[in-house]
C-alpha cells in the first residue's frame, strides 16, 4: 500500500492543478433533478511555492500559537489554488431535456492571492 | 455567552477584512533575535459573498460527499481572504540594531481568485 | 506490469443470473474508477457499467438498469458485475476496464483491458 | 443519452498513406473524447485520450484533434499494424457511448 504507486499519488495530488471527476448531477446544487454523471473539473493543490514574506511569518506566527485568528475564520498562509477559466456543463435532465449552465467547470488553475 | 455581544463579535469576525495583532518579533520566523513586541496585520474571514456557480457547486459536492478530493489537498470553495497591499515592519534586534522587513503585514484585504 | 482478467461468463437461460470477477494485479487498485464494457458478436462496444474508486458511486445505462449491479472489493482487487434476468441481447464478451488516471483526475479514457469473458444468453 | 457517429464506416488503403477518421457527438463533449483501436479476437486499445492526448507506447503517427462535437482521428502514414477497427468514445457524460467504429482494411 506504501509502494511507488502510492508515492507517485501523493507527488501528484500535491501541487496545484487542474482535477477532474464524474459527479452526479444531483449533487451540484443547480436545483435540475437528473440520474446522469457529468465530468466536473475543479482546483486543488498546494500553493506552498507562491508564498510572500508575509505568508511565511503568517505561517510561523499560527504555528507558534503567536496568533490568535478571529473566530471560525482561520487566515491563509499561502495563495489559493482557484480557479482562473471556466467552461459550460450540459446534461440532461429527467425530462430528457438537454441542460447548460455557464462557468461551472474550471478549465485551468492558478495561485491567487 | 449567546447575548447580543458576542452575535455582534461573532459577525464582526465573519467577512474577509484587515485584522491587527500584537505577536514576538522572535514568533516571525524571521532569523532576527529579538525580545520585542511589533504590530501584525494580515488578513481573515468569509468571502461566501463572493463565490461563483462553479464555487456553489464545488461546495455543494463535497457538502453530498459526492467528491473526492486528492489526499491532503481539499479544494476552495470561495475566493481566499488575502492581502492585497502590504506595508514593511520595523523592530530592534537584542543588540539594538533597528530591522526593517518589507512587506511583512498586510494593509487592505480582498477576496481572491 | 497491469493485469485484468476476467472470469464467471458461460451459457445461461434466459431469466437467469451470473457473476462476472475481474481480478486485478500491476496498479494500486484503490486508486482508480472501473468500468465493464461489452462486445456482442460482430457488433461495436457497449459501455455498460461504472464504480468509482471507494465504491461510492455507481452508474448504469437504460439497457442494464435494475438488472445489473457492479461492485468492487479493495481488499482482494477483484472488480465484480452481478447480472440478472439475462437476456439474450445480453449475449456478449464482457471486458474489465480501469481508468488511465487516478480517481481525482478522471477522465473516463480506459486504458487497460482485460481479454474479456464470454457470456452466451440462450435457452 | 449523446449519440456518437463515425464517419467514414469502413475505409481502404495503402500503407504509407495519411488516413483521416471522423467522430461527432450530438452534444457538446467538451475535450472528453477517446479513441481505441481493435484488432480481431484482441480487446480493444487506447490511442487517444481526452481529444489530443498521445496514450504511452502509441506511434508519434496517431494524431487527434477537435472540441465540442467534431473530432477527428488522423494516421500520419499507415503501417501494416493499423489495419483495424478504430472507436471513438465520449467520456463527459453518463451513458459513456462509443461510435458505430471505422474498419480500416488494405487496399
Known amino acids: 500500500a506504501g509502494g511507488p504507486g502510492s508515492r507517485a499519488r501523493a507527488a501528484g495530488a500535491r501541487g496545484c492543478r487542474l482535477r477532474s471527476q464524474l459527479v452526479p448531477v444531483r449533487a451540484l446544487g443547480l436545483g435540475h433533478r437528473s440520474d446522469e454523471l457529468v465530468r466536473f473539473r475543479f482546483c486543488s493543490g498546494s500553493c506552498r511555492r507562491a508564498r510572500s514574506p508575509h505568508d511565511l511569518s503568517l505561517a510561523s506566527l499560527l504555528g507558534a500559537g503567536a496568533l490568535r485568528p478571529p473566530p471560525g475564520s482561520r487566515p491563509v498562509s499561502q495563495p489559493c489554488c482557484r480557479p482562473t477559466r471556466y467552461e459550460a456543463v450540459s446534461f440532461m435532465d429527467v425530462n430528457s431535456t438537454w441542460r447548460t449552465v455557464d462557468r461551472l467547470s474550471a478549465t485551468a488553475c492558478g495561485c491567487l492571492g | 455567552a449567546g447575548g447580543p455581544g458576542s452575535r455582534a463579535r461573532a459577525a464582526g469576525a465573519r467577512g474577509c477584512r484587515l485584522r491587527s495583532q500584537l505577536v514576538p518579533v522572535r514568533a516571525l520566523g524571521l532569523g532576527h533575535r529579538s525580545d520585542e513586541l511589533v504590530r501584525f496585520r494580515f488578513c481573515s474571514g468569509s468571502c461566501r459573498r463572493a463565490r461563483s456557480p462553479h464555487d456553489l457547486s464545488l461546495a455543494s459536492l463535497l457538502g453530498a460527499g459526492a467528491l473526492r478530493p486528492p489526499p491532503g489537498s481539499r479544494p476552495v470553495s470561495q475566493p481566499c481572504c488575502r492581502p492585497t497591499r502590504y506595508e514593511a515592519v520595523s523592530f530592534m534586534d537584542v543588540n539594538s540594531t533597528w530591522r526593517t522587513v518589507d512587506r511583512l503585514s498586510a494593509t487592505a484585504c480582498g477576496c481572491l481568485g | 506490469q497491469v493485469q485484468l482478467v476476467e472470469s464467471g461468463g458461460g451459457v445461461v437461460q434466459p431469466g437467469r443470473s451470473l457473476r462476472l470477477s475481474c481480478e486485478a494485479s500491476?496498479?494500486?487498485?484503490?486508486?482508480?474508477?472501473l468500468h465493464w464494457v461489452r462486445q456482442a458478436p460482430g457488433k461495436g462496444l457497449e459501455w455498460v457499467a461504472f464504480i468509482s474508486n471507494d465504491g461510492s458511486n455507481e452508474y448504469y445505462p437504460k439497457s442494464v438498469k435494475g438488472r445489473f449491479s457492479i461492485s468492487r472489493d479493495n481488499s482482494k482487487n477483484t472488480l465484480y458485475l452481478q447480472m440478472n434476468s439475462l437476456r439474450a441481447e445480453d449475449t456478449a464478451v464482457y471486458h474489465c476496464?480501469?481508468?488511465?488516471?487516478?480517481?481525482?483526475?478522471?477522465?473516463?479514457?480506459?486504458?487497460?483491458w482485460g481479454q474479456g469473458t464470454l457470456v452466451t444468453v440462450s435457452s | 443519452d449523446i449519440q456518437m457517429t463515425q464517419s467514414p464506416s469502413s475505409l481502404s488503403a495503402s500503407v504509407g498513406d495519411r488516413v483521416t477518421i471522423t467522430c461527432r457527438a450530438s452534444q457538446t463533449i467538451n475535450n472528453y473524447l477517446n479513441w481505441y483501436q481493435q484488432k480481431p479476437g484482441k480487446a480493444p486499445k487506447l490511442l487517444i485520450y481526452?481529444?489530443?492526448g498521445l496514450q504511452s507506447g502509441v506511434p508519434s503517427r496517431f494524431s487527434g484533434r477537435g472540441s465540442g462535437t467534431d473530432f477527428t482521428l488522423a494516421i500520419s502514414s499507415l503501417q501494416p499494424e493499423d489495419f483495424a477497427t478504430y472507436y471513438c468514445q465520449q467520456s463527459y457524460h453518463s451513458p459513456f457511448t462509443f461510435g458505430p467504429g471505422t474498419k480500416v482494411d488494405i487496399k
Open positions: 476496464t480501469k481508468e488511465r488516471d487516478y480517481y481525482y483526475d478522471s477522465s473516463g479514457s480506459l486504458d487497460y
Open positions: 500491476g496498479f494500486t487498485f484503490s486508486d482508480y474508477d
Open positions: 481526452t481529444t489530443s
